[in-house]
């Protein structure tokens, strides 16, 4: 009786149990009551990254310098080339078929954590005693200058934006 | 022992000015910022304003940067603030207060209570 | 400006329970610069002016009774009173300092049963 159910790594086809084609290779033809199933290597470019039946290997992914792209990860017979963005920039999606430049944080703002390929920068306010007076993807919010410790007093406090002005002691006396 | 006094009250007509005093004791009054607090009756506390008795330094609330003047006497270790035009809306207790750095306020005086009536 | 919001605005209990304050602020008060919270919580007495309890959410000032701890980052944070006393009879206000102009919650109004 012909089987109706196959063991893993096997397909049903013309009612009998056929091997699948294992990662890196493509079917050529199915067996036969006489044959194995027939599979061939994928071309330079190509890969499928299962045990399988298709009859065409999937095209590499390809890095595209003009939407910011290039190759993190070379791909194989198995496994699909994986793009990152260039240095700079990070992925719009997980997908990562293209790429937007990083994120500046604000005068006010400091880089709370460094974008990396995939995600962006995250800036976080400046907070009363720091600031940051320039436009940055790598800049923190810096603590204001201690006046004391250089035996100044503050002449002019500091804001998110600007540090604050020391002067001498005695300048009001 | 740290120490910020304020007068108990002040009674006050309306479109007169008022100036607070807030006398500190126990530390180096130059060294430390001073804030002032407004808290109406039943109300809760709202940030005016601070001054560095150093140079005089000053950081407004924009809310209150036309009704409040900051200055300070350092002979004296007195921080002052003046408030002009007042309307009964201004009648509360005005707080003053040390800053710990610039941030929490760990030395409070015990307030002026501040009357606005014709 | 930050605003501070605190519940319950009041509450009463009765003396040896536990209480649990809490104040929530319109934007994150955590600064990974110093990995400190800008918060602070003071206790107004019938009266008085307010006395500072915690400082950077969750340190106790010097002289505060240790049943008084803060806890909580970010937005939301607690003031906690592990045994209230009659004593503790008294308005609750949360600050932040992590912006001009310095804003404070509305308060929370413990009373005793």
């Known amino acids: 009786e012909p089987p109706t159910a196959c063991r893993e790594k096997q397909y049903l086809i013309n009612s009998q149990c056929c091997s699948l084609c294992q990662p890196g290779q493509k079917l050529v033809s199915d067996c036969t009551e006489f044959t194995e199933t027939e599979c061939l290597p994928c071309g330079e470019s190509e890969f499928l990254d299962t045990w399988n039946r298709e009859t065409h290997c999937h095209q590499h992914k390809y890095c595209d310098p003009n939407l910011g792209l290039r190759v993190q990860q070379k791909g194989t017979s198995e496994t699909d080339t994986i793009c990152t963005c260039e240095e700079g920039w990070h992925c719009t999606s997980e997908a990562c078929e293209s790429c937007v430049l990083h994120r500046s944080c604000s005068p006010g703002f400091g880089v709370k954590q460094i974008a990396t390929g995939v995600s962006d920068t995250i800036c976080e306010p400046c907070p009363v005693g720091f600031f940051s007076n320039v436009s940055s993807a790598f800049e923190k919010c810096h603590p204001w200058t201690s006046c004391e410790t250089k035996d100044l007093v503050v002449q002019q406090a500091g804001t998110n934006k600007t540090d604050v002005v020391c002067g001498p002691q005695d300048r009001l006396r | 022992q740290v120490q910020l006094q304020q007068p108990g009250a002040e009674l006050v007509k309306p479109g007169a000015s008022v100036k607070l005093s807030c006398k500190a004791s126990g530390y180096t009054f130059i060294n430390y910022w001073i804030n002032w607090m407004r808290q109406r009756p039943g109300q809760g506390l709202e940030w005016i304003g601070n001054i560095y008795p150093g140079s005089s330094s000053t950081t407004y609330n924009e809310k209150f940067k036309s009704k409040a003047a900051l200055t300070v006497d350092t002979s004296s270790s007195t921080a002052y603030m003046q408030l002009s035009s007042l309307t009964s809306d201004d009648s509360a207790v005005y707080f003053c207060?040390?800053?710990?750095?610039?941030?929490?306020?760990?030395?409070w005086g015990a307030g002026t209570t501040v009357t606005v009536s014709s | 400006d930050i605003v501070m919001s605190q519940s319950p605005s009041s509450l009463a209990v009765s003396v040896g329970e536990k209480v649990t304050l809490s104040c929530k602020s319109s934007q994150s008060l955590f600064f990974s610069g110093n990995q400190k919270n800008f918060l602070a919580w003071y206790q107004q007495k019938p009266g008085q002016s307010p006395n500072l309890l915690i400082f950077?959410?969750?340190t106790r000032e010097s002289g505060v009774p240790d049943r008084f701890t803060g806890s909580g980052s970010g937005t939301d944070f607690t003031l906690t009173i592990s045994s209230v006393k009659a004593e503790d009879l008294a308005v609750y206000y949360c600050?932040?300092?992590?912006?001009?102009?310095?804003?404070f919650g509305s308060g929370t109004k413990l009373e005793i049963k």
């Open positions: 600050q932040q300092y992590y912006s001009y102009p310095f804003t």
């Open positions: 950077w959410a969750s």
């Open positions: 207060a040390r800053s710990v750095g610039y941030w929490y306020f760990d030395v």
